[in-house]
């Protein structure tokens, strides 16, 4: 697994413990919480990142204050169960034996139940809508410049293949980034749109997961793009199963 050999760190995931104890003294990095070896040449899965977040030092919460533009974090943090590949297990349960089914980005997609609840398969989130509102600027950004900059960001920073950025919509001050990736489209080695969206979300909040990189400095033709609100919507290949009671509440 690719890690920075000189001082043995993981460029793509600071929530790791790295040591030169791999084969031949090579640097090997393991995710906090799960202890799973991670590939530092690409993004770490969201499941492993959430698990690491739950066991990170308190300093990771007290010393990293979300940026002033960050949204309030209501992303339903929990300590997930990950499979041997680092993906979310379809069924998640808490310490009090309350269980629920999740999609491939770890978001609950059924009502909560008990240990008898069955989640037959991990349903793939194939469409992610990232809604951003930027801070007021002198004028609107040029749409094609904004589109190019955001596509460049997802390609270079998150290593997401350009074909998975379906569209960038802009109606000042709202930006909507559409990520699409069907099961059939995702080849071995492709970054998952759910992982890219999670890294982006953490970057926007000023809580970068990258080792030794400052936070996001988004600029469109030299003009800073400062995000003041973010909403992320997830659409699954199979619609979620919530009771009518929840839907009418």
């Amino acid at each position: 697994h690719t890690a920075a050999q000189d001082n043995c760190t993981c460029p793509t995931n600071k929530m790791t413990v790295c040591s030169p104890d791999g084969p031949g003294g090579r640097c090997q990095c393991r995710a906090l919480g799960s202890g799973m070896a991670v590939d530092c040449s690409t993004l770490t899965s969201k499941c492993l990142l959430l698990k690491a977040r739950m066991s990170a030092p308190k300093n990771a919460r007290t010393l990293v204050r979300p940026s002033e533009h960050a949204l309030v974090d209501n992303d339903g943090l929990y300590d997930p169960d990950c499979d041997p590949e680092g993906r979310f297990k379809a069924r998640q349960c808490n310490q009090t034996s309350v269980c629920w089914c999740v999609n491939s980005v770890g978001v609950r997609r059924t009502d909560k139940g008990d240990l008898s609840l069955r989640c037959d398969e991990l349903v793939r989130t194939h469409h992610i809508l990232i809604d951003l509102r930027h801070r007021p600027t002198a004028g609107a950004f040029n749409h094609s410049d904004l589109d190019a900059e955001l596509r460049r960001l997802f390609r270079e920073r998150y290593r997401l293949h350009p074909k998975f950025v379906a569209a960038v919509h802009y109606e000042q001050p709202t930006i909507q980034i559409e990520l699409r990736q069907n099961t059939s489209q995702k080849a071995a080695g492709d970054v998952d749109i759910g992982d890219a969206a999670y890294y982006f979300e953490r970057d926007i909040k000023g809580e970068s997961l990258f080792q030794g990189r400052g936070g996001l400095d988004l600029r469109v033709r030299g003009e800073p793009l400062q995000v003041e609100r973010t909403l992320i919507y997830y659409l699954d290949e199979i619609p979620p199963k919530f009771s009518m009671k929840r839907l009418t509440a």
Partner: antibody, heavy 118, light 106 residues
Framework: QVQLVQSGAEVKKPGASVKVSCKAS????????MNWVKQAPGQGLEWIGI????????TYNQKFQGKVTITVDKSTSTVYMELSSLRSEDTAVYYC???????????WGQGTTVTVSS | DIQMTQSPSSLSASVGDRVTITCQAS??????LAWYQKKPGKAPKLLIH???NLQTGVPSRFSGSGSGTDFTFTISSLQPEDIATYYC????????FGQGTKLEIK
């Protein structure tokens, strides 16, 4: 190679202030936190405070609150520590230290001796 | 605030000896403990982080173990160049160093 280079030794009178600098090179400056650590003569190491150069946020050891101010100049990749109202007990070697991703201190400056004497 | 109690404060050993230093935290710090070597007139040097992970370039005679509140640092076979003062550092909740252990050759 990561290098932290600190400013030279200082001799100050009681009541004065001193500003020590720490210039970083060899890695992304805003990607790591920076700390200051004190070692008084014959004593152990004491953590003073931390700054996140990206946002400029600081957190201090309660013991040094009001005594120390940590600032950053991103344009020169330099962190500063100012000690005010100096007293003889402030005589010490002060080190800057980079915080790794999980915050332990992986690289250190060479140290700056501050002597407070009338 | 987390307190770190390091012992012994000093110890004398012969070249080739196995040397053990302990650090006790006043509350659970998981495995967020590092060990440093400090020589007079020099900056501290990171030896071990996350309780037992050897920093790149550090000889394998140095090791660490523990979890929660009790931690141990070991030099399996003392070498003359190991003469120094050793400090533990908890980095779970802010930062606290142990008082240090001064290691001397008999």
């Amino acid at each position: 190679q990561v290098q932290l280079v600190q400013s030279g030794a200082e001799v100050k009178k009681p009541g004065a202030s001193v500003k020590v600098s720490c210039k970083a090179s060899g890695s992304s400056f805003t990607g790591y936190t920076m700390n200051w650590v004190k070692q008084a003569p014959g004593q152990g190491l004491e953590w003073i405070g931390i700054i996140n150069p990206y946002q400029g946020d600081t957190t201090y050891n309660q013991k040094f609150q009001g005594k120390v101010t940590i600032t950053v100049d991103k344009s020169t990749s330099t962190v500063y520590m100012e000690l005010s109202s100096l007293r003889s007990e402030d005589t010490a070697v002060y080190y800057c230290a980079r915080g790794a991703g999980l915050y332990y201190f992986d690289y250190w400056g060479q140290g700056t001796t501050v002597t407070v004497s009338s | 605030d987390i307190q770190m109690t390091q012992s012994p404060s000093s110890l004398s050993a012969s070249v080739g000896d196995r040397v053990t230093i302990t650090c006790q935290a006043s509350q659970d710090i998981n495995k967020y403990l590092a060990w440093y070597q400090k020589k007079p007139g020099k900056a501290p040097k990171l030896l071990i982080h996350y309780t037992s992970n050897l920093q790149t370039g550090v000889p394998s005679r140095f090791s660490g173990s523990g979890s929660g509140t009790d931690f141990t640092f070991t030099i399996s076979s003392l070498q003359p160049e190991d003469i120094a003062t050793y400090y533990c550092l908890q980095y779970d909740d802010l930062f606290t160093f142990g008082q240090g252990t001064k290691l001397e050759i008999k």
